[in-house]
Interface confidence: low
């Protein structure tokens, strides 16, 4: 089948990194600079993405693959393939139309991006608050008072749980 297809369509022989050049009797021409073709049999090459402004180049464009962008420090990627860069905020804040704002009481954000989320309501699970929440950390729920053994007068609270990659402030 491949052999038949090649006889019928000479473009099918053009590998990635080239395009089938109709102006030159359908020979395979290399993609011009700043363009690429990631699959064989292409009749055109695609223009490379340019990482400008708040975007920076994570991977250079090659003749067979597009450039990949990420964001300059202080910004993070949003959207498929980092189509947008959004400003970072501090932990304990969220980004609003007016800039970074502290989380309201009863909410927290333990990342530099995203929105403030409500503290966990321990009582919904019949548990008590072991460690109070902050703007940066959720509450830590402990066993309900009824679960404590009669001799246990206090419970040593564990250190607040931290997500991997987040160092203490």
């Amino acid at each position: 089948f491949e052999r038949t297809r090649s006889l019928q369509d000479p473009c099918s022989n053009c590998p990635a990194g080239t395009f089938c050049d109709n102006n030159r009797n359908q020979i395979c021409s290399p993609c011009p600079p700043n363009s690429f073709s990631s699959a064989g049999g292409q009749r055109t090459c695609d223009i490379c993405r340019q990482c400008k402004g708040v975007f920076r180049t994570r991977k250079e464009c090659s003749s067979t693959s597009n450039a990949e962008c990420d964001c300059t420090p202080g910004f993070h990627c949003l959207g498929a393939g980092c189509s947008m860069c959004e400003q970072d905020c501090k932990q304990g804040q969220e980004l609003t139309k007016k800039g970074c704002k502290d989380c309201c009481f009863g909410t927290f954000n333990d990342q530099k991006r995203g929105i403030c989320r409500p503290w966990t309501n321990c009582s919904l699970d019949g548990k008590s608050v072991l460690v109070n929440g902050t703007k940066e950390r959720d509450v830590v729920c402990g066993p309900s008072p009824a679960d404590l053994s009669p001799g246990a007068s206090s419970v040593t609270p564990p250190a607040p749980a931290r997500e991997p990659g987040h160092s203490p402030q």
């Epitope: 050049d21 030159r24 021409s29 290399p30 600079p33 700043n34 363009s35 695609d46 490379c48």
Partner: nanobody
Framework: EVQLLESGGGEVQPGGSLRLSCAAS????????MAWFRQAPGKEREFIGR????????DYVESVKGRFTISRDNPKNTLYLQMSSLRAEDTAVYYC???????????????????WGQGTLVTVKP
């Protein structure tokens, strides 16, 4: 034989406009990126702007952005440079150039281009 021939230069007053043309022959014009450069007396050749082979992307030097526009007509094998709001410092010989298929150099450097026209003189003076 690859040939590039610029035309359309001349004398113009500050604030005026000119349209330069670059006629290509001897090769598949539509397969290559094209650029305009200029060279003022006693200065190095300066990149003005480049248009990708399929007009999919354009790059301009900061000093001409908003004033100069590059376009191309692939069926006519012709590259254009529309210049407006011309200033005295735009006085130079203007060259068109064909972009290499492969180059290690940045698109703004002359080494990225393998064929050049003979140039057309643009003079801006009151």
């Amino acid at each position: 034989e690859v040939q590039l021939l610029e035309s359309g230069g001349g004398e113009v007053q500050p604030g005026g406009s000119l349209r330069l043309s670059c006629a290509a022959s001897g090769w598949a014009f539509g397969n290559y990126g094209m650029a305009w450069f200029r060279q003022a007396p006693g200065k190095e050749r300066e990149f003005i702007g480049r248009l990708a082979w399929n007009a999919g992307s354009t790059d301009y030097v900061e000093s001409v952005k908003g004033r100069f526009t590059i376009s191309r007509d692939n069926p006519k094998n012709t590259l254009y440079l529309q210049m407006s709001s011309l200033r005295a410092e735009d006085t130079a010989v203007y060259y068109c150039a064909r972009q290499r298929s492969y180059s290690r150099y940045d698109i703004r450097t002359p080494q990225t281009y393998d064929y050049w026209g003979q140039g057309t003189l643009v003079t801006v003076k009151p």
